[in-house]
């Protein structure tokens, strides 16, 4: 029971990381700026990786998106990679899951194959987490470390003189948002694998049962399948003297017609 | 590269009218606002009036109800029209722009033009 409570409580907290990794990736608010030096009105600049966007006082919003652009920084694409890798590998780690869940059955699937395939989800939910975090955490770095800003303050180009407008860079929702999912990512996968020993059949280890008679000698008995269970000549539950015989997990366990005393 | 380029200037009498128009062009991202500044001779350069992309305008009190600001951003340009000029209107306008280029899309950066001379005679 605490097993598939495990293994359920997992799937979940996956399936609420992949979806949030996703809504993260999606989200323009990865960087925000405000632009202080508007003299017309108080203008928002916010991005993502897909696309920037200006919001003004008035309400409107324009958004441009990146695609069309070929000379992205690296960095950038970085980040996206890390993000999607984790999306994949999230998506394939619950369709795994779905089958490995102990509350489903699916034909005649062996518990063993439960146990693997629960622990190769976990895995892929630990790898998507981590890129998540990864990811966010390497375009946290880019802001920080104002990675974006052009050295160059003020120069003269060829229309006359540019200058680099002084904007503060602030973490936007999204990475807060992929942090956290990430994070949950991660511990659905942890329970995923911790569910996966609990599944996992331990090898049956029958002992050898002694019998001990009334008198003076003593029979070894090898245990077989029909000493272990019970299962024998004895159909018809006779009374049948066992001689105080028992297993080592203390269940009773019946001679059959093979064994001599 | 990107250039502002300013045209429309001159020579005008007292009352008269003059358009100006300003041409953002070359490696664009996004534009953000567009607008005017002036520089008279011996002076400090002084905020016009300016447009942002979803059309919010302000004038400096000076040239309230005088000049209208307005902008094609299809085409990326501004301009301004400039009635019932007077001799103090007399300076070099500056087209302006915050903007972010195609090899910085996380980057804004404040673009002037070289100006374009306008002249009221009294």
């Known amino acids: 029971m605490a097993v598939t409570a495990c293994q359920g409580l997992g799937f979940v907290v996956s399936l609420i990381g992949i979806a949030g990794i996703i809504a993260a990736t999606c989200m323009d608010q990865w960087s925000t700026q405000d632009l202080y030096n508007n003299p017309v009105t108080a203008v928002f600049n916010y991005q993502g990786l897909w696309r920037s966007c200006v919001r003004e006082s008035s309400g409107f919003t324009e958004c441009r998106g990146y695609f069309t652009l070929l000379g992205l920084p690296a960095m950038l694409q970085a980040v996206r990679a890390l993000m999607i890798v984790g999306i994949v590998l999230g998506a394939i780690g619950l369709l795994v899951s779905i089958f490995a869940l102990k509350c489903i059955r699916i034909g005649s699937m062996e518990d063993s194959a439960k146990a693997n395939m629960t622990l190769t989800s976990g895995i892929m939910f630990i790898v998507s987490g981590l890129c998540a975090i990864a990811g966010v955490s390497v375009f946290a770095n880019m802001l920080v470390t104002n990675f974006w800003m052009s050295t160059a303050n003020m120069y003269t180009g060829m229309g006359g003189m540019v200058q680099t407008v002084q904007t503060r860079y602030t973490f936007g929702a999204a990475l807060f948002v992929g942090w956290v999912a990430g994070g949950l990512t991660l511990i659905g996968g942890v329970m995923m694998c911790i569910a996966c020993r609990g599944l996992a059949p331990e090898e049956t280890n029958y002992k050898a049962v002694s019998y001990h008679a009334s008198g003076h000698s003593v029979a070894y008995k090898p245990g077989g399948f029909k000493a272990s269970t019970g299962f024998g000549s004895n159909t018809k539950n006779k009374k049948i003297y066992d001689g105080g015989a028992r297993t080592e997990d203390e269940v009773q366990s019946y001679p059959s017609k093979h064994d001599y005393v | 590269a990107v250039q502002l380029v300013e045209s429309g200037g001159g020579l005008v009498q007292a009352g008269g009218s003059l358009r100006l128009s300003c041409v953002a062009s070359g490696s664009i991202f996004q534009i953000n606002t567009m607008g005017w500044y002036r520089q008279a001779p011996g002076k400090q350069r002084e905020w016009v009036t300016g447009?942002?992309?979803?059309?919010?305008?302000r004038y400096a009190d000076s040239v309230k109800g005088r000049f209208t600001i307005s902008r094609d951003n299809a085409k990326n340009t501004v301009y301004l029209q400039m009635n019932s000029l007077k001799p103090e209107d007399t300076a070099v306008y500056y087209c302006?722009?915050?903007?972010?280029?195609?090899?910085?899309?996380?980057?804004?950066?404040?673009?002037w033009g070289q100006g374009t001379q306008v002249t009221v005679s009294a």
């Open positions: 447009i942002t992309t979803g059309g919010t305008t």
């Open positions: 302006n722009s915050d903007l972010k280029t195609t090899s910085n899309v996380f980057q804004w950066y404040e673009y």
